[in-house]
């Protein structure tokens, strides 16, 4: 069956960028890389510089939602990630410039953030059961929780 | 500690057909593009192009576009440039190259082969 | 396609001089811009990155900057094991272009 958010008709407006040029790291302290081109993948780094640094965008929902909703963009690119289903990879989609609305089944682009102390946890909005989550020999992809890594820490002003 | 390694100097006649081998080793092979780059005797670098080691999917130059194929055995982790129809300005050394995207946007090459001398001549 | 175009493509200098070499893109490449160094005979090696990060292991006295559309590489104090010719590249778009090179020797 289709995902709530697809048979529902909210629209999603872009708001600001609330974040720049921040690295995500996961619970094992494995940064996000970009592997060939449209993946990401998890590892430990000597060197930080090869973490993707990322951009968050907020969105506001027509309907009153307390979440909040974002975008996340590859720092001076136009590459955003995007959803796919269940153990599939998340993806780099190249758009010209950042959606100003989202609806239908656009939201795969869109996600939930949500912090718990340092913790922070990206839920799809297209699958709102499904976390961003990094697993040992995969690609960076969507899953419901262990054995994926579903929290990340936020480093920003890394030099 | 990450290696490519290339295969070996090859004679060739006009014409015939050649296939450069590139052996990577101390990484995981399908997380990092490879690209080719070409240098003629005397001549600078000329990027030919690259091959995603994860799908397969190769992008070339528009001067490397119809004789030039890359293609992978992702068992061995091993690239490979063919080049078909040879002709004498193809006379060259080929090196294979690691892609690496630093802040998931600056595209840069930090290993390479060891390079392979093609000599074409009649 | 992005076109880089590097000057000059030879020069002659002292040990201990500073030296210095242009990049120039036909477009605003953010900064997406690398050097690398190619003793006669032997392999590329990438030296600088993303305009002035230096690559482990290379030494100090090789630097990086600009923005834009220009940029420059040097070297503080020229040793005689830095003959080689010296290649910019640009990292923002394919195709991956490289410069066309700059041949730096010691008088």
């Known amino acids: 069956s289709a995902p709530f958010s697809f048979l529902s008709n909210v629209k999603y407006n872009f708001m600001r960028i609330i974040k720049y040029e921040f690295i995500l790291n996961d619970a094992l302290n494995q940064s996000i890389i970009r592997a060939n081109d449209q993946y990401l993948t998890a590892a430990a780094l000597h060197n930080l510089d090869e973490a993707v640094k990322f951009d968050m965008g907020a969105y506001k929902s027509s309907k009153d939602d307390a979440k909040i909703t974002v975008i996340l963009r590859i720092s001076k690119t136009q590459l955003y990630v995007t959803a796919q289903d269940e153990d599939q990879p998340v993806l780099l989609k190249e758009m010209p410039e950042i959606p100003k609305t989202i609806t239908g089944s656009e939201t795969n682009l869109l996600f939930f953030w949500e912090t718990h102390g340092t913790k922070n946890y990206f839920t799809s909005v297209a699958h709102p059961n499904l976390f961003i989550a990094t697993k040992q020999d995969y690609w960076v992809c969507l899953a419901g929780g262990p054995p994926s890594i579903t929290d990340f820490q936020i480093l920003e002003n890394q030099a | 500690e990450i290696q490519l390694v290339q295969s070996g100097a090859e004679v060739k006649k006009p014409g015939a057909s050649v296939k450069v081998s590139c052996k990577a080793s101390?990484?995981?092979?399908?997380?990092?593009?490879m690209n080719w780059v070409r240098q003629a005797p005397g001549q600078d670098l000329e990027w030919m192009g690259w091959?995603?080691?994860?799908?397969?999917?190769?992008t070339y130059a528009d001067d490397f576009k119809g004789r030039f194929t890359f293609t992978l055995d992702t068992s061995t982790s091993t690239a490979y440039m063919e080049l078909s129809s040879l002709r004498s300005e193809d006379t060259a050394v080929y090196f294979c190259a690691r892609g690496i995207y630093y802040y998931g946007s600056s595209y840069a090459m930090d290993y390479w082969g060891q390079g392979t001398t093609v000599t074409v001549s009649s | 396609d992005i076109q880089m175009t590097q000057s000059p493509s030879s020069l002659s200098a002292s040990v201990g001089d500073r030296v210095t070499i242009t990049c120039r893109a036909s477009q605003d490449i953010s900064n997406m811009l690398n050097w690398y160094q190619q003793k006669p005979g032997k392999t590329p090696k990438l030296l600088i990155y993303y305009t002035s990060r230096l690559y482990p292991g290379v030494p100090s006295r090789f630097s990086g900057s600009g923005s834009g559309t220009d940029y420059t590489f040097t070297i503080s104090s020229l040793q005689p094991e830095d003959i080689a010719t010296y290649f910019c590249?640009?990292?923002?778009?394919?195709?991956?272009?490289f410069g066309q090179g700059t041949k730096l020797e010691i008088k």
């Open positions: 590249q640009q990292g923002k778009t394919l195709p991956y272009a």
């Open positions: 091959i995603n080691t994860y799908t397969g999917e190769s």
């Open positions: 101390g990484y995981t092979f399908t997380n990092y593009g």
